[in-house]
Each structure stands twice: as structure tokens, then as C-alpha cells.
């Protein structure tokens, strides 16, 4: 049994690091393999995830860390039995992915403006709360090329755009992420998305 | 929200058993060592036990001056951390701190007094 | 076991000045590119409370005037400008190994 593509892990930089790998063969991850990590500190407590499946060799095992600050670096040791078959390192604020924004909601009730709202995903006490700037992506559900993407990048979840920037008469979804430049992170995942019916009043043209 | 909350404390005479609890909440509890630091009345912080998580099987560790007195342990299911306190002495009279420990002591409960006295 | 030495044992600054508060450690405490001394303080009654980690980590809701800095056996606690409500006795404490120990504690007043 051995590695065939090593370990990679991202952190939420919250509670949760992600780490994938695979191996050169069918795997049961979960009864073959365990996955060791420790911060690196001597008075630190070692701990064990248990990994899953992701797909035929795949493996992924989620980290729980109750608690994360950019000096933090782990020790990683994957195990098969009494087997190393692979030791590395993992500094989570060099790998952060953020949390994906939630509850999006769209209120079209405010005067031919449409408000976008969404919660931020991390507590006001987390360094990341006030470092996420967003993407807000909106589609057409009937018109594949009517796909837009607004960079919000003030630190208000928010966003307002005018109803007649899109088409009257017919649904829209609209998705948000977030990424914080401080780490230099990846995008977090998609928000689920929300769909709405545009419409508006036409101005009424004189002639 | 971090919470430890100490109890237990009191008087007590020398020679005589006291037993400290100490609940925590807010926090994946199971994953942390937990320790004791205790100050005498006008005095400094003394470290004086820990307890490691059962991933590093609830491997503890003692102060020379309490060393074969005092006993910690845990309750995961119950997030509860205790310090049995046998053959007391009046230098034990002090403030009791549960104390969490991940890069350095980070969170500290209130605190529960100690008086050994005839 | 590891000997901290804190000096001074009391210091008195004028507010919006100064503090500065030393520690050396009897061994060194810093390795794997980490010093594992930690800063508190303690008011009156109150049980102490983490200021900086790993040598000069600001612990978090912790105001940016307080800072530490140091390496292997000399450690350092500035505060800066000081203000009222930092009268208080501060400690230094390493968690390079077991038994974990503190310093004396420097009673830091107002002139």
C-alpha cells in the first residue's frame, strides 16, 4: 500500500481542515487508514482522524481544530496499521479556504432596487470576520449568457444593483462567495443559491 | 464562549481530603489538556497539575509539592476535570484555577479558595 | 525545571508612557522556530488573563499597546502608551516543558 498523490489540505481557519490524497490502489480509508496531526508544540495533544472514501483510491479526512491563529504549524502522519506511509506538515493559515457565506437573501421590495443580503460565516471574535470581501454571481434561468459576477469588496455582506440592470418578466438566481487577501486564500465554496421573479416598472417615456 | 468553572472548595483541616471541580464549556473539551495552577493568598502562580487528552491517554503530570497527594483526571462525556486533594497541609491554602492548555494557558476559570486550617 | 526571573518586581510610569517588563528563562524556551513564553496579567481578585503567546503573539480582544519580543532566554513586555486601567500584576510563564512555571510577577502602578 502506498501514497500515490500526497496529502493537500485546506483550512476553514475556524474549526475544520480538509486534507485529500490519494492512493495507489482501491482503499477503504476509514477501517485501512488514520491520519495523525499535532500542533507543533511540545505540550501539544496528538489527535486521530479517521478518513473516508472519496472516490475509488481517495481518501479525506476532515481535522477538527477547535481553534486556529496564523503561527500555528501541524505535524501530519498518515498511518496504515503500524505502517508510516507518509509524514508532511500543515501551516493552516497558508492554506485557508473560507467558510461559504449563508442565508442569501434578495429583497425586491425597495423602490426598482434590488438588496442582496447574506451572512458573514465567521464569528466577530475570528481574525477572518473582518477580512472577506465577496463575489455575487446572477444568472438567468432562461438565458444561459445572461451570467454576471459584482465584486463586493467593502466588508458589508451586502449588495445593491438597480432591477432594471436585469431583465424584466423573468427568474434569477444569484450565488455568493467570499476570500479574504489577508491570506491570500482560494475561494470558499458557492453559497446555495436563491432564486427570485425580476420585475419593474418600464419609465414611462414621453414623446 | 470559553467557560470553566471551578468548585469544591472550602475549609479544611490539615491531614484532611478535598475534592475541586471544574466544568468546562464552550469548547471541544475532549481535544485539550487541562491543568491546575494555584496562588497562595498575596503570592505568585504555581503550576501544579495536567491531565492529557485521551488521545495521549490521559497521561498526567504533577508538581514535586503535591506529587503523591494530589490526583487529576477527567470526564470527557461530562467536559469535568478534578483534582482529588489528600493529606493537606496549610502551605496547600490558596486559590484554585482550571486552567485550559493549547499553545500556552489560555483559558482560566474563576477559581475556587482553599483553606487548610485547624 | 526552568527558572523565569522577572524584573522588576514593581515598576511605577506615568500614564500615556512606558512600561517595560523583562523575563529570563533559566534554559532556553524557543525551538522548531518557536519560544514558548507567554505573557499575563492580574488584577485584584481576578484570575489572570493571556496577553501575548508564543513571545509576541497579540492574544485576541488584547489591546495593540501591549507587545512582546525575545528569543532562547530573554523576553520582553512593552506597553504602550500605558493607561489607567493596566495597573496590574504581570507574569511570565513558558510551556517549553513540564513542570510549567512562572515568574514572580511585576506590580505595574501609576505615578
Known amino acids: 500500500m502506498k501514497v500515490l498523490q500526497e496529502p493537500t489540505c485546506v483550512s476553514d481557519y475556524m474549526s475544520i481542515s480538509t486534507c485529500e490524497w490519494k492512493m495507489n490502489g482501491p482503499t477503504n480509508c476509514s477501517t485501512e487508514l488514520r491520519l495523525l496531526y499535532q500542533l507543533v508544540f511540545l505540550l501539544s495533544e496528538a489527535h486521530t482522524c479517521i478518513p473516508e472514501n472519496n472516490g475509488g483510491a481517495g481518501c479525506v479526512c476532515h481535522l477538527l481544530m477547535d481553534d486556529v491563529v496564523s503561527a500555528d504549524n501541524y505535524t501530519l502522519d498518515l498511518w496504515a496499521g503500524q505502517q508510516l506511509l507518509w509524514k508532511g506538515s500543515f501551516k493552516p493559515s497558508e492554506h485557508v479556504k473560507p467558510r461559504a457565506p449563508g442565508n442569501l437573501t434578495v429583497h425586491t421590495n425597495v423602490s426598482d432596487t434590488l438588496l442582496l443580503t447574506w451572512s458573514n460565516p465567521y464569528p466577530p471574535d475570528n481574525y477572518l470576520y473582518n477580512h472577506l470581501t465577496y463575489a455575487v454571481n446572477i444568472w438567468s434561468e432562461n438565458d444561459p449568457a445572461d451570467f454576471r459576477i459584482y465584486n463586493v469588496t467593502y466588508l458589508e455582506p451586502s449588495l445593491r444593483i438597480a432591477a432594471s440592470t436585469l431583465k424584466s418578466g423573468i427568474s434569477y438566481r444569484a450565488r455568493v462567495r467570499a476570500w479574504a487577501q489577508c491570506y491570500n486564500t482560494t475561494w470558499s465554496e458557492w453559497s446555495p443559491s436563491t432564486k427570485w421573479h425580476n420585475s419593474y416598472r418600464e419609465p414611462f417615456e414621453q414623446h | 464562549e470559553v467557560r470553566l468553572v471551578e468548585s469544591g472548595g472550602g475549609l479544611v483541616q490539615p491531614k484532611g481530603s478535598l475534592k475541586l471541580s471544574c466544568e468546562a464549556s464552550?469548547?471541544?473539551?475532549?481535544?485539550?489538556?487541562m491543568n491546575w495552577v494555584r496562588q497562595a493568598p498575596g503570592k505568585g502562580l504555581e503550576w501544579i497539575t495536567h491531565i492529557r487528552s485521551k488521545s495521549n491517554n490521559y497521561a498526567t503530570y504533577y508538581a514535586d509539592s503535591v506529587k503523591d497527594r494530589f490526583i487529576i483526571s477527567r470526564d470527557d462525556s461530562e467536559s469535568m476535570v478534578y483534582l482529588q486533594m489528600n493529606n493537606l497541609k496549610t502551605e496547600d491554602t490558596a486559590m484554585y484555577y482550571c486552567?485550559?492548555?493549547?499553545?500556552?494557558?489560555?483559558?482560566w476559570g474563576q477559581g475556587t479558595s482553599v483553606t487548610v486550617s485547624s | 525545571d526552568i527558572v523565569l526571573t522577572q524584573s522588576p518586581a514593581s515598576l511605577a510610569v506615568f500614564l500615556g508612557q512606558r512600561a517595560t517588563i523583562s523575563c529570563r528563562a533559566s534554559?532556553?524556551?524557543?525551538?522548531?522556530?518557536?519560544?514558548?513564553m507567554h505573557w499575563y496579567q492580574q488584577k485584584a481578585g481576578q484570575p489572570p488573563k493571556l496577553l501575548i503567546y508564543?513571545?509576541?503573539n497579540l492574544e485576541s480582544g488584547v489591546p495593540a499597546r501591549f507587545s512582546g519580543s525575545g528569543s532562547g532566554t530573554d523576553f520582553t513586555l512593552n506597553i504602550h502608551p500605558v493607561e489607567e486601567e493596566d495597573a496590574a500584576t504581570y507574569y511570565c510563564h513558558h510551556s517549553r516543558e513540564l513542570p510549567i512555571t512562572f515568574g514572580s510577577g511585576t506590580k505595574l502602578e501609576m505615578k
Open positions: 534554559k532556553s524556551v524557543s525551538t522548531s522556530g518557536y519560544s514558548y
Open positions: 464552550g469548547f471541544s473539551f475532549n481535544m485539550y489538556a
Open positions: 508564543l513571545a509576541s
Open positions: 486552567v485550559r492548555l493549547l499553545r500556552a494557558l489560555d483559558y
